[in-house]
């Protein structure tokens, strides 16, 4: 199969002319049978031509198909293929002038679009519209056989598909869709041009689309001054292209001198050296296949970059605490570059940087170096330190930015009690000032144990971490290798670079938080009265464990006490507690005995039950009410007592028993049940009673006795008694005792409101005091009776009884606190001097 090829596989000229009058006919496109009908389509680009040499108008040659051929720039060697089956080439050389004068001549460029989806042919007439416009049509006929050698000879016209080309006055464009799978096939095509009834056909052409790719122009063209003061021109690589590209960069530098350059590179960047401040650069870039095939892309849109009058390189530095950093600067002032010896450096325009930190790189480049940097403290919205390069007279408003981040991020890890996963936590708080940064945990695992000095490896894995509501990130390793060393660090990624925290190595086995002990029980032991706590250790880990017990009185706010157990085999502990009759709440936790890892959570709480643990500590305090005529030898006595509190009953009272003893009747007992009073007949000279409290364990061993004795009831031991109301809630009683020969055990104060039905109230007080504050609700203007009884071992003595408060001409005053003060020190005369200013103050601070 003989095909006509243009000189260049993607750019060529097509010369179309009418035949000479001697020609029998004009040849059909190579290899295509002659009897094809003319093709339809719309076009505006073909022109009417007047052939001066023959005087024939094109319109007179309607329905005639004229042959076109390819030519080079000079129009030489214009060749066409005959339609004969032998495939012999009929070549004729025609002077270019003939084509220019007698035909329709085209400049054609064909290429494969960069995204490999479309084959495009672009046509422009060579002559700038020398003829009148006709209603022109251009069609492109194509076929995409996989292998050309398999084609029938000649190829069948029917196998060709047609696309109509879009034409304007100046140009036409034909689009051939190429399936992605066929970009390496041969594309057979020819053009058919119709204008004013005249049809021209190009020879049959063959192209491989993949070899004529025209990439899209590069995107993302940008410029920056590098850390070493060069201009870096960079652009984005074209990820869609399935082949490597080369790039051509052209730039125009307008500085103290103007220079223009074009360079070809295979990378996506180009360095231009010796950039000066106050310069401008206009840059464009285009691309083409690296192997040289195909078509150069269009130029990208021009980008303009202007360097500032003060140039810092680098303009920004991101670094970590403790590191060193340097900035260089070129300072141009009023079109003159300042000598580097005249440059001074300032930090935040607040402090001049010492000249010992300066270096002269060249005549115009000054360098400042910072050593052992401290973390940048954010100042308002500024999260960096501003480093200013200044001349000796003034500072330019531009500055370099120094970001110093504390990357000492503590990563703490914890292996769960089932030994199935390790959870690591870390806080980004030290790096929150670095806006636009992302953080990630990276790690690598060593098969066994941790290295002495963990280090960051270039090959590391990323661990997905989730930000928690408490501001910490949490990352889970599952499954885990208990004895593998996990070296991990935090990487901070930022547009200015990335920083790594110091690596730490964690052995999952060393950070276990065990499950809490289970089956925790608590009880107060009988008789010993200790808090006994028992538990079972968790299944994992298998290491020896220590235990910690916490216990406290159950309530809203528990005041915990703790007890340590270091015996790994221990499963219980007994602890002394102050209150044997309260509900204690107990919890146990554990950790490895060697101190590695963490304490477990506290176990579920266990509670003690309140049960009797010992016999009651003592019997109840009791007093009596006397009925009947004082002159009679037989009187009813009612004993009264307050129910025993838990701390005394240890921990409950089942019943009370009253023991009687008289000279005549000996000893006998009365079971009172849970009543708190008992009435009996006092008929003998002396009658002693004792009240015992009994719980499930036994009877109280320490008990109070009271002896009723006729002789003792006449013993007058209380000399005087006074009562003073200090407020509506407190009355002070004071007394004097007269010497006697009896053993005074204690005193009993009795009081009652004589205007009320409330009944008598009483208090047992020590024998060695001579005043006492009674706290009750007192109505100062109502009538009260106060009695003071001396209680001797031999029996109850004669009481001193007073009705009402002690009468004095009391001046009512306000005390310091503004509270109604019913008495004051000067109100107290003579015997009342027993009550001092101190007593009054005691009341007011009670």
């Amino acid at each position: 199969l003989n095909l006509a090829y243009p000189t260049s596989p993607w750019r060529f000229k097509l010369f179309c002319a009418p035949p000479s009058t001697t020609d029998d006919s004009f040849l059909s496109p190579a290899g295509v049978p002659n009897n094809t009908s003319s093709l339809k389509g719309a076009s505006e680009a073909l022109v009417e031509a007047k052939f001066n040499s023959t005087g024939i108008y094109v319109s007179e040659l309607s329905k005639t198909i004229f042959h076109c051929c390819f030519g080079n720039e000079q129009g030489q060697n214009c060749s066409a293929l005959t339609g004969n089956t032998e495939g012999k080439t009929l070549a004729s050389v025609v002077k270019p002038l003939v084509f220019r004068q007698l035909g329709v001549n085209w400049d054609i460029e064909c290429w494969m679009k960069g995204d490999l989806t479309l084959f495009i042919c672009h046509m422009e007439p060579l002559l700038k519209n020398p003829f009148k416009n006709y209603d022109s049509k251009v069609h492109l006929l194509y076929d995409l056989p996989e292998v050309i050698d398999d084609l029938p000879l000649p190829p069948l016209k029917d196998s060709f598909q047609t696309v109509q080309c879009n034409c304007s006055v100046r140009e036409c464009e034909c689009h051939v869709p190429v399936p992605r799978a066929k970009v390496n096939y041969a594309l057979l095509m020819y053009l058919e041009i119709t204008s004013a009834g005249v049809s021209f056909q190009s020879p049959l052409m063959s192209l491989q689309p993949m070899l004529v790719v025209k990439p899209d122009p590069p995107l993302g063209l940008r410029m920056e001054v590098t850390d070493d003061g060069n201009l870096k021109i960079s652009w984005d690589s074209q990820t869609k292209a399935p082949f490597p590209l080369q790039y051509q960069v052209k730039y125009l530098e307008n500085s103290t001198i103007v220079r223009e350059a074009a360079e070809i590179v295979s990378d996506t960047s180009l360095l231009v050296d010796s950039v000066l401040p106050g310069s401008s650069y206009e840059v464009q870039v285009r691309s083409k296949r690296l192997d040289g095939s195909g078509v150069w892309s269009d130029w990208s849109l021009p980008q303009l970059f202007t360097t500032q009058d003060v140039m810092y390189f680098p303009p920004k530095i991101l670094t970590s605490v403790g590191s060193n950093a340097s900035f260089c600067c070129i300072y141009k002032n009023e079109n003159q570059t300042i000598s580097s010896k005249q440059i001074v450096w300032w930090m935040n325009l607040a402090e001049k940087i010492p000249e010992t930190q300066y270096n002269t790189v060249s005549d115009h480049i000054s360098k400042v170096t910072f050593s052992n940097l401290k973390a940048t403290r954010p100042r308002g919205k500024f999260t960096y330190d501003a480093v200013y390069c200044c001349n000796e007279q003034a500072c330019h408003h531009r500055y370099a930015e120094l970001y110093v981040i504390d990357v000492n991020i503590n990563i703490s890890c914890e292996t769960d009690g089932y030994l199935t996963k390790m959870t690591c936590r870390w806080s980004p708080s030290t790096i929150q000032s670095l806006v636009g940064s992302t953080v990630q945990l990276r790690y690598h695992r060593r098969s066994l144990y941790c290295p002495d000095n963990p280090s960051i490896r270039p090959t590391s894995e990323l661990k997905n971490c989730v930000l928690q509501t408490d501001g910490f990130y949490e990352c889970v390793f599952q499954p885990i290798f208990l004895l593998s060393g996990y070296t991990m660090w935090i990487r901070i990624n930022h547009s200015l670079g990335s920083l790594d925290s110091p690596p730490t190595c964690v052995l999952p086995d060393s950070v276990v938080k065990p499950l809490p002990p289970s089956n925790v029980k608590a009880e107060i032991t009988i008789n010993t009265g200790l808090l006994k706590v028992s538990w079972e250790k968790p299944v994992f880990p298998e290491n020896n464990l220590q235990f910690q017990i916490r216990y406290g009185l159950n309530g809203k706010e528990i005041q915990w006490k703790t007890h340590e157990v270091f015996d790994a085999k221990s499963k219980s502990a007994s602890l002394p507690v102050s209150d044997l009759c309260a509900v204690y709440v107990v919890q146990v936790r554990c950790r490895r005995l060697d101190g590695l890892g963490y304490w477990s959570n506290w176990s579920s709480p266990a509670y003690t039950l309140v049960m009797d643990v010992k016999v009651p500590m003592r019997g109840p305090e009791f007093w009596r009410i006397m009925d009947g005529d004082i002159t009679k030898k037989e009187r009813n006595v009612t004993l009264l007592w307050k129910p025993l509190m838990k701390n005394d009953s240890l921990c409950s009272v089942r019943r009370y028993v009253v023991k009687h003893r008289t000279a005549h009747n000996g000893t006998w007992s009365q079971d009172v049940g849970n009543q708190t009073n008992l009435t009996f007949l006092w008929a003998e000279s002396a009658h002693t009673v004792t009240v015992l409290a009994i719980n499930s364990i036994g009877a109280s061993l320490v008990n109070f006795n009271l002896t009723f004795s006729w002789p003792m009831s006449k013993v007058n031991a209380v000399q005087s008694l006074s009562a003073y109301p200090l407020s509506s809630s407190c009355v002070i009683l004071s007394w004097t005792l007269s010497p006697n020969d009896y053993s005074l055990l204690y005193l009993v104060i009795e009081w009652k409101n004589l205007n009320d039905d409330d009944g008598m109230k009483w208090l047992r007080i020590p024998s060695n005091v001579n005043k006492y504050y009674i706290h009750d609700n007192f109505i100062p203007i109502e009538k009260y009776q106060f009695s003071l009884y001396p209680v001797f071992m031999e029996g109850v003595g004669k009481p001193k009884i007073i009705n009402g408060f002690t009468k004095d001409d009391i001046a009512k005053q306000q005390n310091d606190a503004g509270e109604q003060k019913l008495i004051s020190e000067e109100d107290l005369g003579g015997e009342q001097k027993l009550i001092s200013e101190e007593d009054l103050h005691h009341h007011h601070h009670h």
């Epitope: 109301p725 205007n755 609700n777 109505i779 100062p780 203007i781 109502e782 009538k783 009402g804 004095d808």
Partner: antibody, heavy 117, light 108 residues
């Protein structure tokens, strides 16, 4: 039957004085403290003063302290309220009452004091 | 001083109704609270003392309850003679004795 009868109420000018009396009967007078309670026209009850059974303790509301004096004569079963420097806001029906339960269990019908210029 | 606040300040009810009047103290007064009834032109009369004890001679349809800061006087079945003004009074911190502002009970 407990009876308390107040007397001495009248119309006086601001700044003037007045002495109210309360005659008690039907109970042992010297066993009880006594109180004066007043009620301004259309208003609620306001405790004024109190005295203990033996006169040893006297107490007053802040509004009358220093102007009113309470006293008693147990021999005469009588209670008194000496009111000096009277003000318009002292206008009220003044009841004497027997002190009990931190309040008053029996009250007199009251005597009207009007302070007006 | 302890302040006493009664609610409502007035209420209308019918004979046979159950009526509740509440009294609130500005601080805890334990059970030291009395209730009084006063009819127009008459002296007050003690109904309840110590929050819940019925004064002798007072009908049993009157009852009191509460302790601390909140107290109630309840009339279980209102009678025609019960239409009056009711006062609460604290006796916890005296002097001074302080009364509530009163609750007027009217016939509906």
């Amino acid at each position: 039957e407990v009876q308390l009868v107040e007397s001495g109420g009248s119309v006086v000018r601001p700044g003037e004085s007045l002495r109210l009396s309360c005659a008690a009967s039907g109970f042992t007078f010297d066993d009880y403290g006594m109180s004066w309670v007043r009620q301004a026209p259309g208003k609620g009850l306001e405790w004024v003063s109190g005295i203990s059974w033996n006169g040893g303790i006297t107490v007053y509301a802040d509004s009358v302290k220093g102007r009113f004096t309470v006293s008693r004569d147990n021999a005469k079963n009588s209670l008194y309220l000496q009111m000096n420097s009277l003000r318009a806001e002292d206008t009220a029906l003044y009841h004497c009452a027997r002190a009990r339960y931190g309040g008053a269990d029996y009250w007199g019908q009251g005597t009207l004091v009007t302070v007006s210029s | 001083d302890i302040q006493m606040t009664q609610s409502p300040s007035s209420l209308s009810a019918s004979v046979g109704d159950r009526v509740t009047i509440t009294c609130r103290a500005s601080q805890s007064i334990s059970s030291y609270l009395n209730w009084y009834q006063q009819k127009p032109g008459k002296a007050p009369k003690l109904l309840i003392y110590a929050a819940s004890s019925l004064q002798s001679g007072v009908p049993s349809r009157f009852s009191g309850s509460g302790s601390g800061t909140d107290f109630t006087l309840t009339i279980s079945s209102l009678q025609p003679e019960d239409f009056a003004t009711y006062y609460c009074q604290q006796s916890y911190s005296t002097p001074p004795i302080t009364f509530g502002q009163g609750t007027r009970l009217e016939i509906k």
